[in-house]
Structures are given as structure tokens and as C-alpha cells.
């Protein structure tokens, strides 16, 4: 049990109060976090609190200013690059935001040698990616769907690319459905390690279908959003990569990466590059049908110019019990030999673990084991190998980073954060220097977080980064609600669950209960963090107890749980989400006519199916942004987890899988439906139809639509969503406002 | 030794299609961006059109977009170069160089296109 | 598209003695992106100074390439009797690329 103190004590009790709706809006209690810009084994940078960027050397214990606030301010800077060579800084304004990672903004290239602006060939604007090459100071820079490239920052460019078309080409930028659900990046370049090549991705989504939505804003007319989008079994973009050789660009051109025959068969993606030296590289490859994939190693022939893909340097990763990999697939991490790497996949009992790869995945040597799962690798060096897993304790929901001699032999294993802060700290994740000469730790919770400085040789804490001592101080005289994390044993699954609790919880009372539900694939729910939030503030102040469940589809808990929805979305993670409801009433502290459930995005999907399952459980729920119908999402997603739309593969679970085939069963329910009219995610579409189907069935509902608002509802609208949601539950619970 | 060989040349009435052929050998053609480049009779050197190693990208001069078609057949080590709606200002030698935008530095001898009624 | 100026039109020049040829762009090209190349009559154009101001393969030494943003120069040291020809400059930062109107060096 984690049971978060909530410093209540008698003589005290007048002085604490309980949160508010307007703390949670206000992010009064939001915390921070620091995460150092390394720039070598012993420097980082770091943006002050006065917006000056300053350099740190851990081991001189100096710092100093490199960009003034003055010289940001000067061009409304809001993040900064520093060039490999530090002769350079690039500074980045008027952000406009695009989708989940991409966005717009404008470069402006500050001379550090002479205090000046680099003036002549400047950047044209808006840019949509720029970066630094690893070595010195070239630049790649992505605009109008074309990458360009500057020996230096004041010369002229070299255009690479010629065909980028707003929504039709995209090269070294993904398109929306590579954003968001395989590379989960704003950019598609890659330049090699001394910066001698740079790799890109060209999107071809000339002949994918278009969803279009109006975007009202103030205008007589509203003007149409157009998104080249492949729903669920539609045409998908055609991905080619290309590599050019940025010393001396224009003689041999870019050439293309051949791709594995038993890919290019049929449909596939490319799902990430990785690489080794200036001289190989690693791409990955996966089938449309994503139980396959291909892991390709390629050689830069010197004497044919050319780049060379061996079919013995093909590794397949493959999957028979679901799809590949966890939600991605996982990357590899390349050891110091430059051809064998370390690499996250199942094991023959279906947890995921690290393996070694030397020469062929059927040779792999499991470097991990056991009934838990490696979540992450940060870093191999020579000696040692740096990952995340949440094996401490048998606690799926939390993160420790430990360390494996691979000096050694035996290798020997560390857990590095464990024993630190063992009650305030049980969820981790570390960023490295070079060489993993020094790391940060940051402490998500379940305390505070804090962010420490650690020696990567001892691991010893060398300092603390941040401790939010000023968010300790607010909480002090805060009800914070309890927390608890458990588990039930059903049918031989394992449900793990957070339970918030109200301040002055009592078991022998009666409590309304409100589920919140995500319970997307590979998701996790249940984990041991820090968080003050909406659901907060319902336990503090209104007294519910509000429940999270880790049912089936979710993750790193093994295969068996995590494939256990494969074809089959929208039956399991509901059952689970009932189940565990029919457990928590069992307890005896839940007041079973007050249950009420809600959830964002899958959450929403699971929720409204919860609402519509005819079990009666349920008095009330919302759903945000739900998915409605499987063939209205995003083919990457959608397909990863259910097959395709068609007769011959999976269209009869696609089609009972809706929510709008239980339109009926919301009668005896109150649903509150909320949808942003802009959401280029998850579409307007999906709750137009559920409505739809609800007013031909004629059953009665409440919804809410934000106009020009997208999947996240943020800015005002959040605001305006948190109090509706709070209204519609305080009533459905007949709590008094 | 790298030897590139143009053919296909002729006397053509305007309005007239030619296709030029560029049989390559000596290194591996399909990792290499090829080029057309022509010569007009006494005059200076004009680059025509351009295609990457894979052949999936190519580049025209404007004066011939629309009109011309660059190609190539790796299996053949050959490049094309489809020509339609001549016109009397296309006169020239053609010439097809290995490289992309520059540093042309394998040519083949050229072949002459003459265009007139 | 970058225009590429040469001059002079045509050098006349002793065997021996030191030939300088300028090109000159319209827009900065740096030299990472100017070739030089020599033409003789009847023969196709032969790669003197590759991108990037290096020797192409086989070229003697006495070609050299220099310059950076607008302004660049061909010296071919000492003349040989097979270096009289015309020279051409050409650029491959900007489509299209482009090629200068050539300079010709003649025997006095």
C-alpha cells in the first residue's frame, strides 16, 4: 500500500482545508522537474529562472551565463540550441503549434564568437524542424515540406528536396499518422554521428484519403481543415528513406535505403532509424499486418558509394500471440563493437525483456528475467548497461533504474534509485551525459518529485537539481486525499488499482465511487506518481473515492495481459473496469446506487461501452473525445490491434465493437458526451455519431462541444470542462454545490 | 574504367519526340544521381534534367518541364531521356554526366539533336 | 536561378606563364558547391575542380581552385601546351544548376 500522509492531525484539523476546483484550474500545486541539456561528459546547460542560459561543469563547479535574457528577449526567444562547436546558438520563437510534437516557429542564429546576429542568409520562416549536426555547426532545416542544409550558419543553403507539397509530400517532417502513431516525434531526420550524412523520410500521402473539418473561428465563413488521415483499412502513406552525404551534397545526390524484400511484399512502415557510426546505419521496418518486423542493418560502401543492406544483417522480430513489440516497436541500443546491440522484445515466458543480438535474434542472450518487465535502456557504455524496469518489490507501476556490469562476467545487476528515497521515490526515469560520465534522476513520486545529480561511476548523488520545496510548503496546510495502490486476483488475472481516498476516509461509511478509465493497449494507468489533480480535488473536497484499474491491454505486466485484446477491442478492458467495480462494492465502503465512471480519447470509448453494458452498476459517466467506431481511427493505431475492416479479416468485430451498436442500453444512464469540434485525433466524427444514434433511439443524454478545440480541450476550455464535469457528477451523485 | 555512352540523336522536324539512350559502366550506376546536359552549336553548357540512383526523384530545367522525361533502368545500367514537342532552340549536342547538381566528373561524347523542318 | 559571370571572355596567354580565371555569382554560392571544368574543341566538358575547391582524380596539380560567397578564381600555374581551351564555372547549390559562359584560353 502506498498511502500518501496527508499530515492530518486533531489540534490541526481547523487550520488544514481541502482542495479546490480553482487550485486544480490554477495549477497551483504543479510541480517541476529538471532535466539538464547535456553538452558533453561533465556540462550542462540549463535555462534560469530568469530566462539567462547557463552553462554548469559538475566536476569545476562553475557555471556561467553563454546567452543573455537581454539577447533572448531581443527576438522573443522562448528555447534556445547550442551548436556541437559552441560557436553558435540557435533561438526559436513564435511557436505555433501544429499537431501532438509538431509545430511552426522562427530561427534566428546568434554568433557567440562576436556577441552579434548572423546576418546575410538568413533562415527563411516559418520553419517547421531545424537541428544542429552532432560535430560543428551545420544546420538541416525542414520548410515547406523541404529540407535544406547550411555548411554554416551563414551561408547559403543547399535545398535537398524538391517535391514537398503541403499535405501531399512530406520530407524529413512525418506526416500526421507518422506523428502520431510511429515515429511520436515532430521530425524525420537523422543525421549520422560525426555529421557526415543525414538521413530523411519522404511521406508520399498523395493518395490517402482526406478528413476535413471547419474551424469557425471569427470569420464570416469558417474555413476547412484538411489532413491527409488514413482511418482503419484505408490507403496509407508510401514511405521511402533517403541518404545524402552533407560534405559534398550535390555530386552523387540523395540514395535511397532498399528495403527489405520480405517487407516490400506488400503494405509496410518504416518505424525508426538508428545510427551506429558515420558508416552504418539500422532502420526499421514493419509489415502493415504489425506482427512482423525487420530490423536492417546497412553498410556505406566506400568504393561503390553506396549504401548496403546484407540479408544477413536482417533481424525479424515476430510476433504470434499479438502484435510487435509493446505499443512501439522497441529500438535498438548498439554496443561499442558497432554491429551487436541490446534490444527490449518478449521471452519465451512473454515479458518483455532485454536481449543481447550479436549475430542472430534466434542466438539472442537474455540479459533480463523474470515475472516484470524492462521498460527502457538509457545507455550502454564499455562497462555497463543503464535501464529502467518496474521488477522492485513485484510493483508494476513503478520505475527503477538499475545498472548491469557487462564488463564483468558474470554480469552483476545494481538497482541504482531503489534504496534513495524509498517512500518518497518509487517511480524514476535518469538522462546521461556522455559517456554516462554523470546522469540526473527524476523522482516522479509517489512524494514529491525531486531531481538529483548523480556520479555515473559511484552513483553517488552529487547535488539536488530541484526539490519544489515551495509546492511542500503550499501542501502543508492541504487535506491531500490518501492514496492506495493494490491489487485483486480474478480468474486468474491480476487487477491492479489505485484507490484515492478522502482525507478523513472511513471505512464503515458509504462513499460515492467514480471511475477514471483510459485502458488503451500497452497503457498504464496504475502507477506510483505524484499528482494533484481534478481527481484530487474530488476526494479532498467532494468525498468521492475515485478508482483506476489496470485490466487487460495494459502494460508490463506480460504478454498474456497485454495481447489478451488482440482483435477483440472493447470486450476485455470493460469487463475488467466491471469487474473490479463489483470487487470495490464488495469492500463495503462504496455506496453502490452512486458509481459513476468517465475517461478521455480510449478512456472515453471504454467508459461510454462501461455505461452502455447493461449491468446497472453504472448511475452516470462521461466520455471526452471518445473513439466511437474503430474504423474511424487512425489505420496505424487501429490496425495494430485489430486486424482490417474486411470480410476477410476482422470487420464483424469492428462493426460490434461500436458504441453506437448499445445505443439502446444508455436509456437507463445519464451519459454526458463532450467533444472539441477541431480535434484532428480523434474526429468530431465519433461523437457526431454516437449522438446520432442516441437521438434515433430516441434515449436521452447531455453533451458539450468546444468549438475550434482539439483533442486536448486546453486553455479556457479546460476550465469550462473540469466545472461542467464537476456539476454533472456533484449532481448525479446529489451532492449539494 | 568509367565509360558512359550516349545514343539516339537525329534530325528531327520541330514538334517531334527523340528518346536519348546512356549505356553506363565502370561503377555501380544505381547508386548514382545522373545528369543531361546540352550543348548548343557554339554556345556554353546548359544542364537539362536530373535523377536520383533509385530513379524515384527527378529534376528538370524549366525550359524543358513538361516536355522531356528523364528515366533509367538500373537493371540495364541505362538512362533515358524521353523528348516531346522539340522545338528549334533544343538543337544541340546532349551529353549524359554522372552526378547530381555538380561535380559532373564522368561525361559521355555527346550526342547531337538537331531539330528543324 | 544563379547567374555565373566569367571574365574575361578570352585570355591570351604564353605557355609557362600563370593563367587566372574569375567567376563570379550572382547570389553566394561558398566553394563547397563551384566546379571548374575544361572543354576542348569537339570533346565533352572534363571535371577539373570538383565541389568543395578539391582536385577531380588525375588532374596535375598546377589547377587550383580558391574562393568562397561570390567570387572565384581558376590558376592553372604554369600553362602547358594542352591546357589551352575553354574553361566553365558552375554551380550546384540552386536548381537549376548553372554554368558560367565559359572563358577561353588561347595561345598568344
Known amino acids: 500500500i502506498v498511502l500518501r500522509p496527508s499530515r492530518v492531525h486533531n489540534s490541526e484539523e481547523n487550520t488544514m482545508r481541502a482542495l479546490t476546483l480553482k487550485d486544480i484550474l490554477n495549477g497551483t500545486f504543479s510541480y517541476k522537474t529538471f532535466f539538464p541539456n547535456w553538452i558533453s561528459g561533465q556540462e550542462y546547460l540549463h535555462q534560469s529562472a530568469d530566462n539567462n542560459i547557463v552553462l554548469y561543469n559538475i566536476e569545476t563547479g562553475q557555471s556561467y551565463t553563454i546567452l543573455s535574457n537581454r539577447t533572448m528577449k531581443s527576438v522573443n526567444a522562448s528555447n534556445y540550441g547550442l551548436s556541437p562547436d559552441r560557436q553558435f546558438v540557435y533561438l526559436e520563437s513564435d511557436y505555433s503549434k501544429l499537431w501532438r510534437y509538431s509545430y511552426t516557429a522562427t530561427y534566428y542564429i546568434y554568433d557567440l564568437s562576436n556577441g552579434e546576429f548572423v546576418r546575410g542568409n538568413e533562415l527563411p520562416r516559418p520553419i517547421q524542424y531545424l537541428c544542429w549536426s552532432p560535430v560543428g555547426s551545420k544546420l538541416a532545416y525542414v520548410y515547406q515540406n523541404n529540407i535544406y542544409l547550411k555548411q554554416r550558419p551563414g551561408d547559403p543553403p543547399f535545398q535537398i528536396t524538391f517535391n514537398g507539397r503541403e499535405n501531399k509530400i512530406f520530407n524529413g517532417i512525418p506526416d500526421w499518422v507518422y506523428e502520431e502513431e510511429m515515429l511520436a516525434t515532430k521530425y524525420a531526420l537523422w543525421w549520422s554521428p560525426n555529421g557526415k550524412f543525414l538521413a530523411y523520410a519522404e511521406f508520399n500521402d498523395t493518395d490517402i484519403p482526406v478528413i476535413a473539418y471547419s474551424y469557425y473561428g471569427d470569420e464570416q465563413y469558417p474555413r476547412t481543415i484538411n489532413i491527409p488521415y488514413p482511418k482503419a483499412g484505408a490507403k496509407n502513406p508510401v514511405v521511402r528513406i533517403f541518404i545524402i552525404d552533407t560534405t559534398y551534397p550535390a555530386y552523387v545526390g540523395p540514395q535511397e535505403v532498399p528495403v527489405p524484400a520480405m517487407i516490400a511484399s506488400s503494405d509496410y512502415y518504416f518505424s525508426w532509424l538508428t545510427w551506429v557510426t558515420d558508416e552504418r546505419v539500422c532502420l526499421q521496418w514493419l509489415k502493415r499486418v504489425q506482427n512482423v518486423s525487420v530490423l536492417s542493418i546497412c553498410d556505406f560502401r566506400e568504393d561503390w558509394q553506396t549504401w548496403d543492406c546484407p540479408k544477413t544483417q536482417e533481424h525479424i522480430e515476430e510476433s504470434r500471440t499479438g502484435w510487435a513489440g509493446g505499443f512501439f516497436v522497441s529500438t535498438p541500443v548498439f554496443s561499442y563493437d558497432a554491429i551487436s546491440y541490446y534490444k527490449i522484445f518478449s521471452d519465451k515466458d512473454g515479458y518483455k525483456h532485454i536481449h543481447y543480438i550479436k549475430d542472430t535474434v534466434e542466438n539472442a542472450i537474455q540479459i533480463t528475467s523474470g515475472k516484470w518487465e524492462a521498460i527502457n535502456i538509457f545507455r550502454v557504455t564499455q562497462d555497463s548497461l543503464f535501464y529502467s524496469s518496474n521488477e522492485f518489490e513485484e510493483y508494476p507501476g513503478r520505475r527503477n533504474i538499475y545498472r548491469i556490469s557487462i564488463g564483468s562476467y558474470p554480469p552483476s545487476k545494481k538497482c541504482v534509485t531503489c534504496h534513495l528515497r524509498k517512500e518518497r521515490c518509487q517511480y524514476y526515469t535518469a538522462s546521461f551525459s556522455d559517456y554516462a560520465k554523470y546522469y540526473a534522476l527524476v523522482c516522479y513520486g509517489p512524494g514529491i518529485p525531486i531531481s538529483t545529480l548523480h556520479d555515473g561511476r559511484t552513483d553517488q548523488e552529487i547535488k539536488i537539481l530541484e526539490e519544489n520545496k515551495e509546492l511542500e510548503n503550499a501542501l502543508k496546510n492541504i487535506q491531500l486525499p490518501k492514496e492506495e495502490i493494490k491489487k485483486l486476483e480474478v480468474d486468474e488475472i491480476t487487477l491492479w488499482y489505485k484507490m484515492i481516498l478522502p482525507p478523513q476516509f472511513d471505512r464503515s461509511k458509504k462513499y460515492p465511487l467514480l471511475i477514471q478509465v483510459y485502458g488503451g493497449p500497452c497503457s498504464q494507468s496504475v502507477r506510483s506518481v505524484f499528482a494533484v489533480n481534478w481527481i484530487s480535488y474530488l476526494a479532498s473536497k467532494e468525498g468521492m473515492v475515485i478508482a483506476l484499474v489496470d485490466g487487460r491491454g495494459t502494460a508490463f505486466q506480460g504478454d498474456k495481459l497485454l495481447y489478451a485484446v488482440y482483435r477483440k477491442l472493447g470486450v476485455y478492458e470493460v469487463e475488467d473496469q466491471i469487474t473490479a467495480v463489483r470487487k470495490f462494492i464488495e469492500m463495503g465502503f462504496i455506496d453502490e446506487k452512486r458509481i459513476a465512471i468517465w475517461g478521455w480519447s480510449y478512456g472515453g470509448y471504454v467508459s461510454s461501452l462501461a455505461l452502455a453494458s447493461g449491468t446497472g452498476l453504472f448511475k452516470c459517466g462521461i466520455a471526452v473525445a471518445p473513439v466511437s467506431s474503430w474504423e474511424y481511427y487512425a489505420s496505424v493505431y487501429t490496425e495494430r490491434f485489430m486486424g482490417l475492416p474486411t470480410k476477410d479479416d476482422n470487420l464483424e468485430h469492428y462493426k460490434n465493437s461500436t458504441v453506437m451498436a448499445r445505443a439502446e442500453y444508455f436509456r437507463n444512464v445519464d451519459y454526458l458526451l463532450i467533444h472539441g469540434t477541431a480535434d484532428d485525433n480523434v474526429h468530431f466524427q465519433n461523437s457526431a455519431q454516437i449522438a446520432k444514434a442516441l437521438v434515433n433511439a430516441q434515449v436521452d443524454f447531455q453533451a458539450m462541444w468546444y468549438s475550434d478545440q482539439n483533442h486536448g480541450l486546453s486553455g479556457l476550455s479546460t476550465n469550462h470542462l473540469y466545472t461542467h464535469m464537476t456539476h454533472f457528477l456533484k449532481q448525479c451523485f446529489s451532492l449539494s454545490d | 574504367e568509367v565509360q558512359l555512352l550516349e545514343s539516339g540523336g537525329g534530325l528531327v522536324q520541330p514538334g517531334g519526340s527523340l528518346r536519348l539512350s546512356c549505356a553506363a559502366s565502370?561503377?555501380?550506376?544505381?547508386?548514382?544521381?545522373m545528369s543531361w546536359v546540352r550543348q548548343s552549336p557554339g554556345k556554353g553548357l546548359e544542364w537539362v534534367s536530373a535523377?536520383?540512383?533509385?530513379?524515384?526523384?527527378?529534376y528538370y530545367a524549366d525550359s524543358v518541364k513538361g516536355r522531356f522525361t528523364i528515366s533509367r533502368d538500373n537493371s540495364k545500367n541505362t538512362l533515358y531521356l524521353q523528348m516531346n514537342s522539340l522545338r528549334a532552340e533544343d538543337t544541340a549536342v546532349y551529353y549524359c554526366?554522372?552526378?547530381?547538381?555538380?561535380?559532373?566528373?564522368?561525361w559521355g561524347q555527346g550526342t547531337l539533336v538537331t531539330v528543324s523542318s | 536561378e544563379i547567374v555565373l559571370t566569367q571574365s574575361p571572355g578570352t585570355l591570351s596567354l604564353s605557355p609557362g606563364e600563370r593563367a587566372t580565371l574569375s567567376c563570379r555569382a550572382s547570389?553566394?554560392?561558398?566553394?563547397?558547391?563551384l566546379a571548374w571544368y575544361q572543354q576542348k574543341p569537339g570533346q565533352a566538358p572534363r571535371l577539373l575542380i570538383n565541389?568543395?575547391?578539391r582536385r577531380a582524380t588525375g588532374i596535375p596539380d598546377r589547377f587550383s581552385g580558391s574562393g568562397s560567397g561570390t567570387d572565384f578564381t581558376l590558376t592553372i600555374s604554369r600553362l602547358e601546351p594542352e591546357d589551352f581551351a575553354v574553361y566553365y564555372c558552375?554551380?550546384?547549390?540552386?536548381?537549376?544548376?548553372?554554368f558560367g559562359q565559359g572563358t577561353k584560353v588561347e595561345i598568344k
Open positions: 565502370g561503377f555501380t550506376f544505381s547508386s548514382f544521381a
Open positions: 535523377i536520383i540512383g533509385s530513379g524515384s526523384n527527378t
Open positions: 565541389v568543395g575547391s
Open positions: 554526366a554522372k552526378g547530381w547538381f555538380g561535380g559532373f566528373n564522368y
Open positions: 547570389q553566394s554560392v561558398t566553394s563547397s558547391y
Open positions: 558552375q554551380q550546384g547549390i540552386m536548381l537549376p544548376p548553372t
